[in-house]
């Protein structure tokens, strides 16, 4: 019988060892009161797989699209 | 029936160890990634460990990294977590879930099979 949670965070772990390369596309997710959830579809197996937002071209990516979204 | 039972909590002192199993009965674990989740009062349900299901990679948070470890033995159903080192900040109720996709970094994971979770206790 499955306990219900008192909320619902899409991504509970979480891909460290994920190559740029190997992504599709990434959604960004702003979920209350859930970490950053970052999905990736991966071309190897078209999963969707929940990345670490610690990857360093994570961090690259999010501050390029950050500084892309305020820029005047 | 279909559940998942939890099993080998406790109270232990700080410093100890324990040894959680989570048995499938009903259905076989081979197919399913399973995570180990805790929860303490007053606090979120957080993720604290997960093992896939094909390739046997594991995940862990940061904070039972390097003192908990997660194994599976499939021809028993049962999913183990051991955890050493412990701490009483690791006080919570520990579940255990399945999830059908396999793996554990799965978009939307864990919305199926939850037991019913056991209580640890880590106290002087």
């Known amino acids: 019988k499955p306990v219900s949670l008192s909320y619902r965070c899409p991504c509970r772990f979480f891909e460290s060892h994920v190559a740029r390369a190997n992504v599709k596309h990434l959604k960004i997710l702003n979920t209350p009161n859930c970490a950053l959830q970052i999905v990736a579809r991966l071309k190897n197996n078209n999963r969707q797989v929940c990345i670490d937002p610690k990857l360093k071209w994570i961090q690259e990516y999010l501050e390029k699209a950050l500084n892309k979204r305020f820029k005047m | 029936e279909v559940q998942l039972v939890e099993s080998g909590g406790g109270l232990v002192q700080p410093g100890g160890s324990l040894r959680l199993s989570c048995a499938a009965s009903?259905?076989?674990?081979?197919?399913?990634?399973i995570g180990w989740f805790r929860q303490a009062p007053g606090k979120e349900r957080e993720g604290v460990s997960c093992?896939?299901?094909?390739?046997?990679?594991?995940y862990y948070a940061d904070s039972v990294k390097g003192r908990f470890t997660i194994s599976r033995d499939n021809a028993k159903s049962t999913v183990y977590l051991q955890m050493n080192s412990l701490k009483p900040d690791d006080t919570a109720v520990y579940y255990c879930?399945?999830?059908?996709?396999?793996?554990?970094?799965?978009?939307?994971?864990?919305?199926?099979?939850w037991g019913q979770g056991t209580q640890v206790t880590v106290s002087s």
């Open positions: 009903g259905f076989t674990l081979d197919d399913y990634a």
């Open positions: 093992i896939n299901s094909n390739d046997g990679n594991t």
């Open positions: 879930a399945a999830e059908a996709m396999g793996y554990c970094s799965a978009y939307g994971s864990f919305e199926g099979y």
